[in-house]
């Protein structure tokens, strides 16, 4: 039986200033280079040490970039996405999706770059409820002794 890989998904607006060597990261993805199955989105594959993105500290490897200066990155060829970044100017605004991975249950294999999973609150709420019920039952049992 495989365990699930679950994700807490958050979005953030990151404003970067292009440094001497540029923005300082690499990307994968695009309609012609699907890095994640059934997802042609653009993902950060590497952040260059001491580059603009690394010095800012908010962009992370594995983040999905949703837009650049308000321009949607959906349904773009890989090279078109690269060119969009290169022509984005000195001040670059990125809309980014972060995914915090949480492993639940037995560890099962998942394909490289596969982000499928369920929001973590859907797991935490039932677990919390069960814990409270168990604590209540325990206290009732102790009172009867």
């Amino acid at each position: 039986m495989n365990g699930r890989v679950d994700y807490l998904v958050t979005e953030e607006e990151i404003n970067l200033t292009r440094g001497p060597s540029g923005l300082g990261f690499n990307i994968v993805g695009g309609t012609d280079q699907q890095y994640v199955s059934n997802d042609s989105g653009i993902y950060v594959s590497r952040i260059k040490e001491n580059g603009a993105a690394a010095l800012d500290g908010r962009l992370q490897e594995g983040d999905k970039i949703l837009s650049v200066n308000g321009q949607d990155l959906k349904n773009l060829l890989h090279q078109d996405a690269v060119d969009l970044f290169r022509n984005a100017g000195y001040a670059v605004s990125l809309r980014v999706q972060h995914r915090l991975q949480v492993q639940n249950g037995p560890i099962g294999h998942r394909g490289e770059g596969d982000p499928s999973g369920i929001p973590i609150f859907m797991v935490l709420v039932p677990v919390f409820a069960l814990t409270m019920v168990a604590a209540w039952a325990f206290m009732r049992y102790r009172q009867q002794l």
Epitope: N26, I27, R46, K48, Q79, V82, R86, E112
Partner: nanobody, 126 residues
Framework: DVQLVESGGGLVQAGGSLRLSCAAS????????MGWFRQAPGKEREFVAA??????LYSDSVKGRFTISRDNAKNTVYLQMNSLKPEDTAVYYC??????????????????????WGQGTQVTVS
């Protein structure tokens, strides 16, 4: 991690040709930018050529003589070297990094841009 294994080096006369190969492990080879560097005895490692998903870049010293190409189905990148000169004598290294740089492709001429390196193959031009 990605393992890189170069082959195809050897001894060749000036004006001759060689084709170097670099075989890579990993299921997402096509997403990697691949580069070739070389290091002659007593000299620093020097950029030769690179290929991203859809771009190629060459050093001025090999432009028009060397051709970099990739076969994603075979997880292999090639360096076709024609009109070889004695000054091309060096150990040739294959390098890899995942993704394409969002900055000018010229950043790929620096070795710091790459995360994975092969052991190298010797090319000697007499």
């Amino acid at each position: 991690d990605v393992q890189l294994v170069e082959s195809g080096g050897g001894l060749v006369q000036a004006g001759g040709s060689l084709r170097l190969s670099c075989a890579a492990s990993g299921r997402t080879f096509s997403t990697y930018t691949m580069g070739w560097f070389r290091q002659a005895p007593g000299k620093e490692r020097e950029f030769v050529a690179a290929v991203t998903w859809s771009e190629t870049l060459y050093s001025d010293s090999v432009k028009g003589r060397f051709t970099i190409s990739r076969d994603n189905a075979k997880n292999t990148v090639y360096l076709q070297m024609n009109s070889l000169k004695p000054e091309d004598t060096a150990v040739y290294y294959c390098a890899a990094v995942q993704g394409s740089p969002v900055d000018t492709i010229v950043v790929l001429t620096t070795s710091e841009e790459y995360d994975y390196w092969g052991q190298g193959t010797q090319v000697t031009v007499s």
